[in-house]
């Protein structure tokens, strides 16, 4: 293993994660570790001199940057909150506040928005689609012979109770928002008025 700074012919350093090619001197030099920046650029005889990032700044990766990145607070206005503070080798870790979810752009969570759960009213249910989503729910009426009696984003319409299966008779018919009401059949020989 060569120790930086060292000469190389094809401008490709042995350890590209931790070394970089310095064209001015035609040598491979050390990168600075996370949490540090380049205080003095390497020469043919001396390797890179690194220094710890100043307070409230960071570098997350092995680098040959002349400065550190400024730490940023988590942005409340965009719906974020802090999970872990900024350190010299890591920016502040932010997440969406409770009841909020990420809006992504190029795989990055750019802001958070409130999860708006559409409540399907009694007599309706959420239309089943292939996508499992909490937003943009489309509520559709219960099919004949079915009911749904809550305001809910996920409740399904249930079939009306069939009184005869239970040995009962119908007292009141079911609707789209209420079940059939059953009652005991009249006693044999009871007078029907």
């Amino acid at each position: 293993q060569l120790v930086p700074p060292y000469r190389i012919e094809n401008q490709t350093c042995w350890d590209q994660d931790k070394e970089y090619y310095e064209p001015m001197h035609d040598v491979c030099c050390s990168r600075c570790p996370p949490g540090e920046f380049v205080f003095a650029v390497c020469s043919r005889s001396q390797d890179t001199v690194c220094k710890t990032c100043p307070h409230n700044s960071y570098n997350e990766h092995w680098n040959h940057l002349s400065t550190c990145q400024l730490c940023r607070p988590c942005d409340i206005v965009l719906g974020f909150e802090e999970v872990a503070p900024c350190t010299s080798d890591r920016k502040a870790e932010c997440r969406c506040q409770p009841g909020m979810s990420c809006v992504y752009l190029d795989n990055e969570c750019v802001h958070c928005e409130e999860e708006r759960l559409v409540l399907c009213q009694p007599g309706t249910e959420a239309e089943v689609t292939d996508e499992i989503m909490d937003t943009d729910v489309n509520c559709v009426p219960c099919k004949p012979g079915h009911f749904q009696n809550t305001s809910s984003p996920r409740a399904r319409c249930q079939p009306h109770t069939r009184c005869e299966i239970q040995g009962l008779v119908e007292a009141a018919p079911g609707t789209s928002y209420s079940d059939t009401i059953c009652k005991n059949p009249p006693e044999p020989g009871a007078m029907l008025l």
Partner: antibody, heavy 120, light 106 residues
Framework: EVQLQQYGAELGKPGTSVKLSCKVS????????IHWVIQRPGKGLEWIGR????????ICTEKFKNKATLTADLSSNTAYMQLSQLKSDDTAIYFC?????????????WGQGTLVTVSS | DIQMTQSPSQLSASVGDRVTLSCKAS??????LNWYQQKLGEAPRLLIY???ILQTGIPSRFSGSGSGTDYTLTISSLQPEDAATYFC????????FGSGTKLEMK
């Protein structure tokens, strides 16, 4: 110690613009968001918007989108708010306040406020 | 938008009284609430953040509590210098201030 300096008063004529400044000392505004708050005479506090001084990105409430323009200058550690098309109901005190790394969710530091009076 | 309602709008109390100020959100704000004190001609001053954490330098007679939509600022023993207007501020999904409660001395 974090300190915010605002000019005490500005006078503007209806239809013109004023530019308010907020100079921060004791803290790098690159580590903050700078927020602006309005207080009309005898009334409560109302959040106007904020700027990210590192990239100039701003967010303002709908009410102030066409009224307030927020800018910042990292080199002088100063934030600005320009109020355009002044009307009499823009007469108010305007405060600046940063959210910082240690206080990301509250306004622990405030400028003393600039009183803007709109009068012909 | 989430609305913040404070009550009462005005309150008169005597030195030594225990005073309770109320702040109500139009929906759950998950304890994401701050309290500020503002005296005439001054900028607001942060008293309590995150519902119940006392800001450095604020007297211990001030305390905060609440959850969901209902929050309270309590002054355990009112002092003459507490005469001011008090604002709550939610920081859930952005910043919004309450309308304020003006506290006067009897």
């Amino acid at each position: 110690e974090v300190q915010l300096q605002q000019y005490g008063a500005e006078l503007g004529k209806p239809g013109t613009s004023v530019k308010l400044s907020c100079k921060v000392s004791g803290y790098n505004i690159g580590n903050t968001y700078i927020h602006w708050v309005i207080q009309r005479p005898g009334k409560g506090l109302e959040w106007i918007g904020r700027i990210d001084p590192t990239n100039g990105n701003t967010i303002c409430t709908e009410k102030f989108k066409n009224k307030a323009t927020l800018t910042a200058d990292l080199s002088s550690n100063t934030a600005y708010m320009q109020l355009s098309q002044l009307k009499s109901d823009d007469t108010a005190i305007y405060f600046c306040a940063p959210t910082t790394l240690t206080t990301p969710d509250s306004f622990a530091y405030w400028g003393q406020g600039t009183l803007v009076t709109v009068s012909s | 938008d989430i609305q913040m309602t404070q009550s009462p709008s005005q309150l008169s109390a005597s030195v030594g009284d225990r005073v309770t100020l109320s702040c109500k959100a139009s929906q759950n704000i998950y304890k994401y609430l701050n309290w500020y004190q503002q005296k005439l001609g001054e900028a607001p001053r942060l008293l309590i953040y995150s519902t119940n954490i006392l800001q450095t330098g604020i007297p211990s007679r001030f305390s905060g509590s609440g959850s969901g939509t209902d929050y309270t600022l309590t002054i355990s023993s009112l002092q003459p210098e507490d005469a001011a207007t008090y604002f709550c501020q939610k920081y859930y999904s952005g910043f919004t201030f309450g309308s304020g409660t003006k506290l006067e001395m009897k």
